[in-house]
Interface confidence: medium
């Protein structure tokens, strides 16, 4: 079967985010994310939510796995039409390690920049997907300091399927990426069974993102 | 050894709903992705969708969306296809197939392991 | 949907004799790690579909030598380097680097 997918389950009706907020989206690309699809799908549902534009909300993605890519940058696209266009091309560029710290270091230092399109006095928003426990997770806790140094709200995801998938506890890893989640963790925090549930988490993670302007 | 013993075949009457067990066996259950293909009499073979049996999450080929239902009890280490609203087109036979799996941190090969196919014909 | 396109649809074959048969996929099956998902499948009559060959030319165990798989981008091709009579049925190719999973139509093979 493919190590594409599209998602197809439905989900509750479009509810728009018209608030100014500066999204960076970190997503785990390594070889163990199956089916990637199940990650776009996410990506579709989410930010079809969004109103995007240069005075309301920017998203900016960032894909890690050995090495960091950005995807695009916080200021590269002015609609969520052409927002949705790019995030469905975003190819999983895979890799045998799981770099966590520097996934979202680098969105910290670099995709948060002016230069890439952050925005002075807007609340910053990380979101950040994985599906396994980081090989640089000394630097996790400097790293997530760090953020909260510059303000910057953090929501996680866990992906319990290559666990699940391997029979594996997933104990230690569900507590590494509760340690990401900004305070209160239950309502920064949202691990799911495997790739193909991302999309059920995508209305309540919408709505807390969007409660960030309220 | 690794096996998926399908449920026999069905006879059903037009708009009916006919539900297809795959049985799986000499493997960890839940570490494999679960896909339904049917083949239609003369016809090739077409994949209908895919089951996650440690989540139970699902996705489905465009065609069969809103027609098909795939669950799984983790208890007997069953996945189950439904198929509502039959039509003489349904006629086919259907198979469940495992994706192949090379470990945690791996990749995906195809579909390794296939049951023997349940015939469900559809008739007035 | 990515279209596969066999070719012949039917190989009629002497015993002890080659074969070969074509699969061509409507865009690039090169996915983005760099690996090729395009599977061949062997169906006997009465039987189930069983795996020969996994991402364009690697064996699943058990199946003979005398199967092999090559080709790259969209042109790929099973060939059969002699003829047994235990070969006889249908064969498929299957892409699963996009969305969704498709088949070829299948090629018959069969004794002369």
């Known amino acids: 079967v493919s190590p594409t997918f599209q998602v197809v389950n439905s989900i509750a009706p479009v509810q728009e985010c018209s608030t100014q907020l500066d999204i960076v989206i970190v997503l785990d690309g390594s070889n163990s994310i199956y089916p990637w699809d199940s990650v776009t799908a996410f990506l579709n549902d989410l930010l079809e939510r969004m109103d995007i534009g240069p005075k309301q909300t920017q998203v900016g993605i960032v894909q890690y796995g050995e090495n960091v890519t950005h995807e695009f940058n916080l200021n590269k696209y002015s609609s969520t039409e052409e927002v949705l266009v790019a995030a469905k091309k975003i190819v999983q560029r895979g890799g045998r390690q799981t770099m966590t710290a520097l996934g979202i270091d680098t969105a910290r230092k670099e995709a948060f920049t002016e230069a890439r399109g952050a925005r002075r006095g807007v609340k910053k928003v990380m979101v950040i997907v994985t599906d396994g426990e980081s090989h640089d997770n000394h630097r996790l806790k400097k790293v997530i300091q760090d953020c909260e140094d510059e303000n910057i709200q953090r929501f996680s995801i866990a992906i319990l399927g290559s666990y699940n998938r391997g029979n594996l506890s997933t104990e230690k890893f569900v507590e590494e990426i509760k340690s990401i989640a900004s305070e209160p963790t239950e309502k920064h925090f949202f691990n799911v069974s495997d790739e193909l549930a991302l999309v059920t988490i995508v209305k309540t993670l919408g709505e807390r993102i969007f409660a960030l302007e309220a | 050894q690794v096996q998926l013993v399908q449920s026999g075949a069905e006879v059903k009457k037009p708009g009916a709903s006919v539900k297809v067990s795959c049985k799986a066996s000499g493997y960890t259950f839940t570490s494999y992705y679960m896909n339904w293909v049917r083949q239609a009499p003369g016809q090739g073979l077409e994949w209908m969708g895919i089951?996650?049996?440690?989540?139970?999450?699902?996705t489905y080929a465009q065609k069969f969306q809103g027609r098909v239902t795939m669950t799984r009890d983790t208890s007997t280490s069953t996945v189950y296809m439904e198929l509502s609203s039959l039509r003489s087109e349904d006629t086919a036979v259907y198979y469940c197939a495992r994706t192949g799996y090379s470990g945690y941190e791996g990749y995906y090969y195809g579909l390794d392991v296939w049951g023997q196919g349940t015939t469900v014909t559809v008739s007035s | 949907d990515v279209v596969m396109t066999q070719s012949p649809l039917s190989q009629p074959v002497t015993l002890g004799q080659p074969a070969s048969i074509s699969c061509r996929s409507s865009q690039s099956l090169v996915y983005s790690d760099g690996n090729t998902y395009l599977h061949w499948f062997q169906q006997r009559p009465g039987q189930s579909p069983r795996r020969l060959i996994y991402k364009v030319s690697n064996w699943d165990s058990g199946v003979p030598d005398r199967f092999s798989g090559s080709g790259s981008g969209t042109d790929f091709t099973l060939k059969i380097s002699r003829v047994e009579a235990e070969d006889v049925g249908v064969y498929d190719c299957m892409q699963g680097t996009h969305w969704p999973s498709t088949f070829g139509g299948g090629t018959k093979v069969e004794i002369k």
């Open positions: 089951i996650s049996p440690s989540g139970g999450s699902t």
